[in-house]
Structures are given as C-alpha cells and as structure tokens.
C-alpha cells in the first residue's frame, strides 16, 4: 500500500487517520528533501492531483483541507517541486479511512444446527461502519461462571465440545472499531432449546389418479429429535400467496403428505421444521416443483426436477440415498 513507500518527509491527518464520515479534515505534508527548498507542494488523492483548498503554511509544509469528507477509503500522497528537478519528488503517503462507530449489536441469536457440532451466534450489526470493526462474543456459563471470549469480524461458530460449563449460558456481543465501542444486551440460552433439526428435504411427489386425484409429497429429515413440528407451504407457480399446512412429525419414517390440487397446474412446495415448542425454525427447503397431470398419474423426484414429468403407473419407491445433514440458511 501507499504506507510502504520510502518517505522524504512526513504526512499526517487531523483529527486522525481514521475519522467519522462527514467530518472536515486537514492533511498536512512536510517536506524533508536534501538540497531542496520546495517551490510548490502538491497533494494527490487516489492518484489524482488536488487543485483547491491547499494552503502553504511555511517553506516546508502545506495543508490540504476537505469539507464533509464522505469517502470510506482514500490513498493520499504529497510531492514537492524542487528547483533543478524535472519531475516532482515524492514526500510521503498515507491511507485514510472514514466511517462510523459501531451501533449497539442487537437481535443476538445463537442456534445449534443439528449435526454441525457448532453453536452459531449471529446478530444485527446495525448500520455499515465502513471501517474495520471487530466483535467480541462473550459466552458465560451460568453454572460455572466461567467466561470465554471469541473475536470475529461477523458471526461466530463455537464448537459445542468447547461448551463444557453445562447447558445454560449468557451470550453478549461487544462491537469495537477505531471510532467507538458498544455492547449488546445479554442473551440467556439453554443448549437444549436452540437446536434446529437437520434439514427437511422433499424427495418426490406423485399424483394418484383416483376419483378425486390426490398428490402425495414424500419428505424426510435425518434428525434425531423425536418431537418435531413442520410446515409445508405450496402454491401454484402463477400465484403470489402460499397455502400452509402444519404437521406434528415423527421422522422415524419418511413422511407422506396428501394434497388435493387442481389438475394440469405447476405447483411449488417447500418445507421447514423446528423442535416442537422451541423458538427457531429451519430455513425453508429448496423449491420443489410438481406439475399435476390432466388425468394420468405421475411421479416427480429430485432426479426429474427440470420441469419434466413421468406418465404411466405410479412408482413405488425412488431411492433417496443419504440426506445431507448440514443444510443451513437464515433462521425463520
């Protein structure tokens, strides 16, 4: 960067190299070049020479003034015009940054995605700071009172193996940068209450041509949680609004859910689950499309998801193989 150059003088910023966005700032340049009494001192921002707001303070020093500086980052350097020198001589350079102090982190959330082996903590960091902002996540056992701290730039994954202080913890987040520091409220968690079940996946669909045709959606999860509540939402692809069906689910077997749908329409399905009575939902599963036939029974499986469908007899089973256990996304 610009800060690595060999200097023949000094450049500095007032009030500081990192300052609050929108401030008025002064950049000073002082030459210390052998056998050179500078005729003129020049300032460059991101390689472009500045023409205005430059004041000569004395024989070796000049000041560049900016009003309401709004750029997050800029590389500044200054040069001197020396007598008997054809080119300008570089004096020194500096990277400057403007931004904001951090907001108070809020909406601190910690979840354990089943099979991840981690507790994932996230928070709303507030407005963009534009400058390097670090977060310290504090995890304090309510049983042993032992506190662990984790430094991060965004969210944090904490191995559940490192949570040796029982099941109950306080979690809070400190945000800090060059312009300030803020601390969130404390979140109390119980490890058993924050588990999000392994992702539910729709594996196939079939429409059975009975007197009233019905569509069966097959879906499953590898969860080891015995009491799970799920929602399946579905709509015609041409519609805006979703229909939602709720289920108390027992994943000791692959689930089969029945729907009475309009013929010859393309539908989209998604499913999500949570441990019954707990707070956090899985993200919605990926979109699963199924076009109902006019009259002929049909099966749609993951293998046939490119808007194709089978006519003929309904298929008794389609192998699903392993379900992925680490699918994750936003918390519902």
């Amino acid at each position: 960067g610009i800060t690595n150059i060999n200097c023949s003088g000094h450049i500095w910023v007032e009030p500081a190299t990192i300052f609050k966005m929108g401030m008025n700032i002064s950049i000073y340049c002082q030459a210390a070049i052998k056998n050179c009494q500078p005729r003129k001192l020049h300032f460059y921002k991101n390689g472009i020479k500045e023409r205005f707001q430059i004041t000569r303070i004395n024989k070796t020093t000049a000041r560049l003034w900016y009003k309401n500086f709004l750029e997050p980052h800029a590389s500044m350097y200054c040069t001197a015009e020396c007598p008997k020198h054809f080119q300008e001589t570089l004096i020194c350079g500096k990277d400057i940054s403007s931004g904001y102090p951090p907001d108070i982190p809020d909406e601190v959330t910690c979840v354990i995605y089943e099979y991840s082996g981690n507790m994932t903590c996230t928070w709303n960091a507030g407005k963009l700071t534009y400058i390097d902002t670090k977060y310290v996540v504090h995890v304090k056992s309510l049983e042993t009172e032992e506190e662990q701290q984790y430094l991060t730039s965004s969210y944090i994954n904490i191995s559940t193996d490192s949570l040796q202080g029982g099941k109950k913890y306080l979690v809070w987040v400190q945000a800090a940068n060059a312009l300030g520091m803020e601390e969130s409220k404390q979140l109390q968690i119980h490890l058993d209450d924050i588990v999000i079940p392994s992702a539910a996946v729709i594996s196939r669909a079939e429409t059975i041509n009975a007197t009233v045709p019905k569509t069966i959606i097959y879906w499953d999860s590898q969860t080891t949680i015995e009491k799970v509540s799920c929602e399946m939402r579905y709509k015609a692809t041409t519609n805006q609004t979703w229909n939602v069906k709720e289920f108390d689910t027992n994943f000791t077997y692959v689930q089969q859910s029945e729907f009475y749908l309009e013929p010859n329409i393309k539908y989209v399905f998604q499913v999500r689950c949570q441990e019954t009575g707990k707070r956090y939902w899985q993200p919605w599963s990926s979109l699963f499309f199924h076009k109902t036939p006019e009259t002929v029974p049909q099966v749609t499986s993951k293998a046939f998801q490119h808007d194709t469908w089978n006519s003929g007899l309904t298929v008794a089973s389609i192998s699903t193989g392993h379900l992925t256990s680490d699918n994750r996304g936003d918390i519902g």
């Epitope: 089943e114 082996g117 559940t160 392994s198 499953d220 999860s221 000791t252 077997y253 692959v254 089973s317």
Partner: antibody, heavy 118, light 107 residues
Framework: DVQLQESGPDLVKPSQSLSLTCTVT?????????WHWIRQFPGNKLEWMGY???????NYNPSLKSRISITRDTSKNQFFLQLNSVTTEDTATYYC???????????WGQGTSVTVSS | DIVMTQSHKFMSTSVGDRVSITCKAS??????VAWYQQKPGQSPKLLIY???YRYTGVPDRFTGSGSGTDFTFTISSVQAEDLAVYFC?????????FGSGTKLEMK
C-alpha cells in the same frame, strides 16, 4: 467413511459385569446421531440394548434397564457398554452401531463375541 | 414391545430367481421398517429403511414395500452373493425390535 470397532473381554464369569468399548473413527460422537449397542445370540436372534445420543442422553431397552449403562469418553471418541450381573444367557456377539437419523442402523462394528461361563 | 415376525426361517432359491421375504409387525408401524443382510462372520448391513427406501449404494435389485403391519423385501434377480440371512427391524419406536431372520439358500 465412519468406522466402529468393539473391544473387550472374550470371557466373563457369571454375576460379574461385562464392559465393552466402541471406538469410533472419522466422525465425532458429539456431533450427531444415536450410538447403539445391539447383541446377537447364538441362533441369530438380534436384540437392541440401548443408545447414547450425541448430546449424552441415553435410552435403554426396558428388559435390561436395571442392569445396563451406556456412557462415553468424548476425548477418545468412544462409547461404552456396561452390563451388570451377567448370566450365561448374556453370551452373544455384541455390536456397536450408528443410527441413520431416527431410522435404521447404517454403520456397524464387526462385533465382539462374549461368552459368559465359569 | 412390537413383535416382528418373519414366518420363513429358510427360503430356497436359484440364481436369477425372484424371491420375496415377508415380515409382519404386531402393531401398526406406518412405514418404519428396515431390512438388513447378514453374511456369515459379518455384521448386518443396511439395505432398506422406511419400508421402501434403498440405502446408499444398495443395488436396485433389492426393493422393499408395505405399510402398517405387512412388509415385503424382494430380490428381483438373485445373485450368488445374495445368499445370506435377511432381517427386518421396526424403527417406529424404542425398544427397537428385529425379526428372527430368513436364511436364503440355494436349491
């Protein structure tokens, strides 16, 4: 791939305790799944004995509840079976296994044969 | 406890035959039934779970069907390496229980 390996004594005297170890490689037993003990008697009959969940909670076959304990050592990635007050009826091949979600057992150890005899 | 009954202790077959093994649960287990293959000196190997779902890597000549209390495991074209004991198991709830096994042997 996940591997499970049982180890323990071949011979146990009646009224004593039977202790077996299952060592799991390539998957942390604290990360997920239920970890089971199943035994197979001479003549092929299989009996589910119990499991330890990745969180550490346990579930035992009621027919063995007064005699069985399943524990674990997370630092060694091992889980253990202790069966107290054994009789000759406990002579069997003992398997440890991992459960596929809440469904079937997808990974099994190769089994260890235990004879109860004086 | 849920009792799983495999009525045939032995079944005779020839290479290329289609063979079906049945298993009956003493109460409704929806589709929570698995099938295992066990060869001499080996541990059981999972073939089918949830009545009809082939486990990863299992050849498609092996299929399962049924729901409620009656379940069937079928090998569409028996290979020599399929000679083994086949067990059903209910995974509907604990205590998990197994059938007594059906030994597939050559005629």
């Amino acid at each position: 791939d996940v591997q499970l390996q049982e180890s323990g004594p071949d011979l146990v005297k009646p009224s004593q305790s039977l202790s077996l170890t299952c060592t799991v490689t390539d998957y942390s037993i604290t990360r997920g799944y239920n970890w089971h003990w199943i035994r197979q008697f001479p003549g092929n009959k299989l009996e589910w004995m119990g499991y330890i969940h990745y969180s550490g909670s346990t579930n035992y076959n009621p027919s063995l509840k007064s005699r069985i304990s399943i524990t674990r050592d997370t630092s060694k990635n091992q889980f253990f079976l202790q069966l107290n007050s054994v009789t000759t009826e406990d002579t069997a091949t003992y398997y440890c296994a991992r459960q596929y979600g809440l469904k079937a057992m997808d990974y099994w150890g190769q089994g260890t044969s235990v004879t109860v005899s004086s | 406890d849920i009792v799983m009954t495999q009525s045939h202790k032995f079944m005779s077959t020839s290479v290329g035959d289609r063979v079906s093994i049945t298993c009956k649960a003493s109460q409704d287990v929806i589709t929570a039934v698995a099938w295992y293959q066990q060869k001499p000196g080996q541990s059981p190997k999972l073939l089918i779970y949830s009545a009809s779902y082939r486990y990863t890597g299992v050849p498609d000549r092996f299929t399962g069907s049924g729901s409620g209390t009656d379940f069937t495991f079928t090998i569409s074209s028996v290979q020599a390496e399929d000679l083994a004991v086949y067990f059903c198991q209910q995974h509907f709830g604990t205590p998990y229980t197994f059938g007594s096994g059906t030994k597939l042997e050559m005629k």
